[in-house]
Interface confidence: low
């Protein structure tokens, strides 16, 4: 069962990271949570411009998911549908962040209490997505780009997105094996 | 990185059947399905066939009786046979995968099979 | 079997002008999910396809602005606004909505 997310370092409201949101319950392929300029919502195979999102945290639990290449808030209407909006709707655009034990999260429109998922792709119907609520693996991406002196790799934030956020287990082992590489 | 290398003979016989192995790295064949697409000599590009990440396939119905698409996960590896060749079936073959919205973003080298005596 | 009628077969053009390439669908090719799955591909001589354009109107990561796909129904269109030397070689309009899958015949982009 999906636990809320308890890390500590999420209690401080301004919390961001930059994250790609995979997922291996879309029907056809395993995707990233994609963002586009004309605020759809769709799926990129693999890590694109518009699938790197930045995730910042609005209260314990609640995060608002933006993307960084178009400006739009992730946004969920009242029937499920994902739309990408330049504006932030609190109502619409807030998500809760719950945590499963795999290292994969649950998103929920805060206010509707609808999961988030991917929206369907060309799947033969033999093809079934499965059932339930849509898991995201949060994928590093590039911090926000600061100046660096040559040679030094700036650190990696911790991920707060995990029950381990300062790396101290191992490698996580919830990544996909598409991934693995 | 995604790759997908094809090995399989360049020559085959009339009336012999044609077997091509598509390897892939850089993902997982749970993941992705792969397309087997043929282009003719100085012609077009005409799509064979499909295998899902589940494992089942489609066929194009003109090629139905003659072609199999099998996996092995565990390899990544993708078999492509096709029996009763004709000299009308020499091209070059390509495997490729699908993306999320569209369907051939990675493609193989291509194989150049020439059907002769 | 959905047939996928490009035109013109050859489209001679200078550089830096504009482009257009039609392909006509034997029957509409909405999925039954909704959507339309046209794809638009360039092949140079001894490469493989490249995707540029899917499902009609959205740019491949990568693919300049210069390439815009459009249409519905059984109509669609893509565009080039300034063709550069790049962009020489075969385009292939290609459906995905239907079982089996079709391109269409290729249209041959090259300077006038």
């Known amino acids: 069962h999906p636990i809320p997310d308890s890390s500590p370092l999420l209690q401080f409201g301004g919390q961001v990271r930059q994250r790609y949101l995979y997922t291996d319950d879309a029907q056809q392929t395993e995707a990233h949570l994609e963002i586009r300029e004309d605020g759809t919502v769709g799926g990129a195979a693999d890590q694109s411009p518009e699938s790197l999102l930045q995730l910042k945290a609005l209260k314990p639990g609640v995060i608002q998911i933006l993307g960084v290449k178009t400006s739009r808030f992730l946004c969920q209407r009242p029937d499920g549908a994902l739309y990408g909006s330049l504006h932030f709707d609190p109502e619409a655009c807030s998500f809760r962040e719950l945590l499963l034990e795999d290292g994969y999260n649950v998103y929920q429109s805060e206010a509707h209490g609808l999961p988030l998922h991917l929206p369907g792709n060309k799947s033969p119907h033999r093809d079934p997505a499965p059932r339930g609520p849509a898991r995201f693996l949060p994928l590093p991406g590039l911090p926000p780009a600061l100046p660096e002196p040559p040679g030094i790799l700036a650190p990696q934030p911790p991920d707060v997105g995990s029950s381990d956020p300062l790396s101290m287990v191992g490698p996580s082992q919830g990544r996909s094996p598409s991934y693995a590489s | 990185q995604v790759q997908l290398i094809q090995s399989g003979p360049g020559l085959v016989q009339p009336s012999q059947s044609l077997s091509i192995t598509c390897t892939v790295s850089g993902f997982s064949l749970t993941g992705y399905a792969i397309h087997w697409v043929r282009q003719s000599p100085g012609k077009g590009l005409e799509w064979l066939g499909m295998?899902?990440?589940?494992?089942?396939?489609d066929y194009n119905a003109a090629f139905m009786s003659r072609l199999s698409i099998t996996k092995d996960n565990s390899k990544s590896q993708v078999f492509f046979k096709m029996n009763s060749l004709q000299a009308d079936d020499t091209a070059i073959y390509y495997c490729?995968?699908?993306?999320?919205?569209?369907?051939?973003?990675?493609w193989g080298q291509g194989t150049l099979v020439t059907v002769s005596a | 079997d959905v047939l996928m009628t490009q035109t013109p077969l050859s489209l001679p053009v200078s550089l830096g002008d504009q482009a257009s390439i039609s392909c006509r669908s034997s029957q509409i090719i909405v999925h039954n999910n909704g959507d339309t799955y046209l794809e638009w591909y360039l092949q140079k001589p001894g490469q493989s396809p490249k995707l540029l354009i899917y499902?009609?109107?959205n740019r491949f990561s990568g693919v300049p602005d210069r390439f815009s796909g459009s249409g519905s129904g059984t109509d669609f269109t893509l565009k080039i606004s300034r063709v550069e030397a790049e962009d020489l070689g075969v385009y292939y309009c290609f459906q995905g909505s239907h079982v089996p899958y079709t391109f269409g015949g290729g249209t041959k982009l090259e300077i006038k």
């Open positions: 490729a995968r699908n993306g999320y919205d569209y369907e051939f973003v990675y």
């Open positions: 499902k009609i109107s």
């Open positions: 295998i899902w990440k589940s494992g089942n396939t």
